[in-house]
């Protein structure tokens, strides 16, 4: 017969380590007992537990409440044990000694390695503004044992750079994502992806990009000058811009105060029935925390327009 085991066992910090020791023998062979010990620098070996075919499991005081047999169903030839709630101090070598009848004794050693999974953190960089050069968008840090892998998942064009710092049996990895900010990046996700053998799946932390910008301002409403005639109702000027943070709008008249009855509602300037007094230069002011813009238009209210609406009515009435 022979022992089936593994010379390297890996467990995640805080989880249960299965230390395998299975006797593969002839059908008439029996396992009397399995003695488990830790190979110790001082005492040579330190007993963990004894599995007896007749008397069951006996755990040494130093490992009380920490050593169990795997859950049933159990094979009588299986001498494996569970070391519960593994800590880094459990790293080292373990030995199982199997006493069989009639084949005699067998022993095997294995190494236990404890993985420490990372707890990643994402830190956004300084505020992003359109017009900046290459700027730090975010950094992501993860520390684990062994070293974790830190990468970025995003549609945004940019450059990744990472640095790592080793301690004894662990490493801290920091990856930075740099980009040239543009308004098209606004609201785009930037995801830090951390891989580690102690994680069941990659850990992902998403940061939504905010790029401050303010577009040039323009005014809509004067496309057809013929519509700006005395008596027209519902005439409006709309200021067009775009920004992050969303901009605030303000209207002024270059050559004096706004005429009475002219109302400002956000980005729109609303006129009462037009008179020639509404003629003038109007300025739309757009601003946010980043910048301010302005656009001006000249309104000329026509005194004696040809009224195409009335002409149509006359034709239809004749």
């Amino acid at each position: 017969g022979e022992l089936e085991t593994s010379d390297l066992v890996t467990v995640v910090l805080g989880q249960d380590a299965k230390l395998p020791c299975f006797y593969r023998g002839d059908p008439d062979e029996q396992v009397g007992q399995v003695a488990w010990a830790r190979v110790d620098p001082n005492e040579g070996t330190r007993e963990l537990a004894l599995l007896h075919s007749k008397y069951g499991l006996h755990v040494s005081p130093a490992y009380e409440d920490r050593v169990e047999q795997p859950p049933p169903p159990r094979d009588p030839l299986d001498g494996s044990i569970l070391l519960r709630n593994a800590v880094q101090a459990d790293e080292g070598e373990y030995e199982c000694r199997v006493s069989t009848f009639p084949a005699g004794s067998f022993q095997a050693r294995m190494r236990l390695r404890v993985l420490v999974p990372p707890l990643p953190s994402l830190n956004p960089g300084p505020p992003l503004e359109e017009g900046q050069g290459l700027t730090l968008a975010a950094s992501c840090t993860a520390e684990g044992s062994p070293a974790p892998s830190v990468t970025w998942d995003t549609e945004v064009k940019g450059t990744q750079s990472s640095r790592s710092f080793k301690h004894s049996r662990s490493a801290a990895v920091t990856s930075e994502f740099h980009l040239v900010p543009s308004r098209s990046m606004n609201g785009q996700p930037l995801t830090c992806v951390v891989s580690h053998p102690g994680l069941l799946q990659d850990q992902r932390i998403t940061h939504t990009l905010q790029v401050a910008f303010l577009a040039e301002a323009s005014v809509r409403g004067l496309e057809d000058q013929n519509l700006w005639h005395v008596g027209r109702e519902g005439a409006t000027l709309k200021c067009l811009s775009e920004g992050q943070p969303p901009p605030k709008y303000n209207w002024t008249r270059l050559d004096g105060p706004l005429p009475s009855g002219v109302r400002v509602k956000g980005d729109t300037l609303g006129f009462p029935p037009l008179t020639t007094e509404h003629s003038g230069v109007y300025v739309c002011h757009v601003s946010n925390e980043l910048s301010s813009r302005a656009s001006q238009v000249t309104v000329e209210v026509l005194a004696d327009p040809e009224d195409p609406g009335k002409q149509v009515d006359l034709v239809s009435a004749s």
Epitope: S6, D7, L8, T10, V39, D40, P41, G92, E93, R109, R111, G144, S145, P146, A147, P148, S149, V150, T151, S162, S164, K166, S168, R169, A171, V173, S195, H196, P197
Partner: antibody, heavy 116, light 108 residues
Framework: QVQLVQSGAEVKKPGASVKVSCKAS????????IHWVRQAPGQGLEWMGW????????NYAQKFQGRVTMTRDTSISTAYMELSRLRSDDTAVYYC?????????WGQGTLVTVSS | EIVLTQSPGTLSLSPGERATLSCRTS???????LAWYQQKPGQAPRLLIY???NRATGIPDRFSGSGSGTDFTLTISRLEPEDFAVYYC?????????FGQGTKVEIK
């Protein structure tokens, strides 16, 4: 700074044994496993096994089981690798390396020549 | 055991060029368990990259590692004269620890 200094070159006859030493300095010797790797002339790297300087526990590659013995002396921070029943194809440079998951520090190597 | 296959066997390039070295593993390997080493004639190997993508202390940033699963890559962005050497990948996640057979980067 971390250093692993190995013993000098050896010439051995087939069937003999060789014992190579690896003295560690600049760190706590018992805090890291020591591995042994060999490299035949013009060939790649071949892992032989490890020793835990803290416990004395060892693990050998199957190819070398029964022929290799790794030991340590913690009082002088030195690891040893003994290879017995030498054959001509054991001619190689033997390296010790410190394990920090990967092998972050290596000895300078010891050339062992097996020749009749 | 996990077999590591490196390609190409030899890479002939000029200083200033970009070198891309491949390492394929016979079974999936966690990126945390993959390293790259550089070895020059008559010298011991030197750790370049650990955890597939992390540069070891003192390694210039022209060296970078990437990959996951069974496909890993070492890239040297602009070859310097001192970069011409043999490069080995290694997995240390399962026993036995294994190395690739090496890629020699030589001057064209």
């Amino acid at each position: 700074q971390v250093q692993l200094v190995q013993s000098g070159a050896e010439v051995k006859k087939p069937g003999a044994s060789v014992k190579v030493s690896c003295k560690a300095s600049g760190y706590t010797f018992t805090g890291y496993y020591i591995h042994w790797v060999r490299q035949a002339p013009g060939q790649g790297l071949e892992w032989m096994g490890w020793i835990n300087p803290n416990s004395g526990g060892t693990n050998y590659a199957q190819k070398f089981q029964g022929r290799v013995t790794m030991t340590r002396d913690t009082s002088i921070s030195t690891a040893y690798m003994e290879l017995s029943r030498l054959r001509s194809d054991d001619t190689a440079v033997y390296y010790c390396a410190r394990e920090d998951w990967d092998f972050d520090y290596w000895g300078q190597g010891t050339l062992v020549t097996v020749s009749s | 055991e996990i077999v590591l296959t490196q390609s190409p066997g030899t890479l002939s390039l000029s200083p200033g060029e970009r070198a891309t070295l491949s390492c394929r593993t016979s079974q999936s390997v966690s990126s945390s368990y993959l390293a790259w080493y550089q070895q020059k004639p008559g010298q011991a190997p030197r750790l370049l990259i650990y955890g597939a993508s992390n540069r070891a202390t003192g390694i210039p940033d022209r060296f970078s590692g990437s990959g996951s699963g069974t496909d890993f890559t070492l890239t040297i962005s602009r070859l310097e004269p001192e970069d011409f050497a043999v490069y080995y990948c290694q997995q240390y996640g399962s026993s036995p620890i294994t190395f690739g057979q090496g890629t020699k980067v030589e001057i064209k």
